[in-house]
């Protein structure tokens, strides 16, 4: 009748069949259930009997196969850090926490633990777009060709400059990164006074 | 031929410390989990301490954790136990003994005994 | 922590006779008991594990039985050299449990 075939089974080699869903147990030398996800061990296995697991408490979880014998406290996001909730802990999961908007993570320890605000892009300048938002700070890329922005943002993106005759309108000076086209009434002279402003 | 010499027991007092050793010969002692076992005059067996091949591991019965640990010199296939804050109650006869190392887990060798006195 | 309980204690017996000693578990322990003979002044020497099975060495008149939590040694006939002290231990969960030990003496 030895070994077994479902745990606990004896192991002379310290591994498991199973190691997601299994550990070995050296005080007895055998391989032992994990608990799952949501759970805990609330009675150690031995020999004669295979881990007990209890669900874990309210505000507190375990998310892989484990074999710990207490939950992990749930944690809220911490404001302080700049950080906000974008999922609430469950059994089996902790509290999912984002960087607030306009903010980037500074500090990383398997998640972050503190966002700071992102730097502020130049006018002729954008921020790079990321593949996930609030992974790092600003990097400020130039407008490209036909576009302009004319702020100190760290979210503000180049716009396409304005086509003065998809409105009936002349070109008075071109578009720059850091500014839009001026625009003019074909009909009417630019004053002076008046570079740098669309006429109607 | 397996076998297991204990020697180091004595008259201590009260509070006091003493280390026993256990002379492994006969067999790969690095494959074997190691125990202490100890016998009160004219009682039964108790369980005293265990450590796993490598020394690792070790553990031990309520009645003698934080007091009493167990180590192993492979090197040199000898068993330790050093026993601390001695009490009355620890006089006994201290045997090693080997656990099989299948999967029945008995004990299949024990060595001749070292008694250990505790008296004031 | 498991209780072993042994029976009896102590016990009279001739030579040629058969003897039973009993040790009952405080719940199954799934075969994980070792029976062990113990002479005055010497190591308890094993001889049945896994409540069935004869050790190496040992005499054939020396038997093993049981399941759960109810296991028996048997010696089917007495011998001058098996007067002695006898254990039960369980191994199937920690803090492993010796019986109180039973103590055959010649009738």
């Known amino acids: 009748s030895q070994p077994q075939a479902v745990p606990p089974y004896a192991s002379e080699n310290q591994t498991c069949r199973d190691q997601e869903k299994e550990y070995y147990e050296p005080q007895h030398r055998i391989c032992c259930s994990r608990c799952p996800p949501g759970t805990y061990v609330s009675a150690k296995c031995s020999r004669i009997r295979d881990t007990v697991c209890a669900t874990c408490a309210e505000n507190s979880y375990n998310e892989h196969w484990n074999y710990l014998t207490i939950c992990q406290l749930c944690r809220p996001c911490d404001p302080v850090m700049g950080l906000e909730e974008i999922a609430p802990c469950t059994s089996k999961r902790k509290t999912q926490c984002r960087c607030q908007p306009g903010m980037f993570c500074a500090a990383w320890a398997l998640e972050c633990t503190h966002c700071e605000l992102l730097s502020d892009c130049p006018p002729g300048t954008e921020a790079e777009l990321k593949d996930e938002v609030g992974k790092g700070n600003n990097h400020c890329v130039p407008c490209k060709a036909g576009h302009f922005q004319n702020t100190s943002s760290p979210s503000a993106r180049c716009q396409p400059h304005t086509r003065c005759e998809n409105q009936g309108l002349v070109e008075a000076a071109p578009g720059t990164a850091q500014s839009d086209t001026t625009c003019k009434n074909p009909l009417e002279p630019l004053p002076p006074e008046m570079s740098g402003t669309m006429l109607m | 031929e397996v076998q297991l010499v204990e020697s180091g027991g004595g008259l201590v007092k009260p509070g006091g410390s003493l280390r026993l050793s256990c002379a492994a010969s006969?067999?790969?002692?690095?494959?074997?989990?190691m125990y202490w076992v100890r016998q009160a005059p004219g009682k039964g067996l108790e369980w005293v301490a265990t450590?796993?091949?490598?020394?690792?591991?070790?553990y031990y019965p309520d009645s003698v954790k934080g007091r009493f640990t167990i180590s192993r010199d492979n090197a040199k296939n000898s068993l330790y136990l050093q026993m601390s804050s001695l009490r009355a109650e620890d006089t006994a006869v201290y045997y090693c003994?080997?656990?099989?190392?299948?999967?029945?887990?008995?004990?299949?060798?024990w060595g001749q005994g070292t008694t250990v006195t505790v008296s004031s | 922590d498991i209780q072993m309980t042994q029976s009896p204690s102590s016990l009279s017996a001739s030579v040629g006779d058969r003897v039973t000693i009993t040790c009952k578990a405080g719940?199954?322990?799934?075969?994980?008991l070792s029976w062990y003979q113990q002479k005055p002044g010497k190591a308890p020497k094993l001889l049945i594990y896994?409540?069935?099975r004869l050790a190496d060495g040992v005499p054939s008149r020396f038997s093993g039985s049981g399941s759960g939590t109810d296991y028996t040694l048997t010696i089917s006939s007495l011998q001058p050299e098996d007067f002695a002290t006898y254990y039960c231990?369980?191994?199937?969960?920690?803090?492993?449990?010796f019986g109180g030990g039973t103590k055959l003496e010649i009738k």
């Open positions: 003994a080997r656990e099989e190392n299948g999967n029945f887990y008995y004990f299949d060798y």
């Open positions: 006969g067999f790969t002692f690095s494959d074997y989990y």
């Open positions: 450590i796993s091949d490598g020394g690792s591991y070790t």
């Open positions: 719940q199954d322990i799934k075969s994980y």
């Open positions: 896994y409540a069935t």
């Open positions: 231990l369980q191994h199937g969960e920690s803090p492993w449990t």
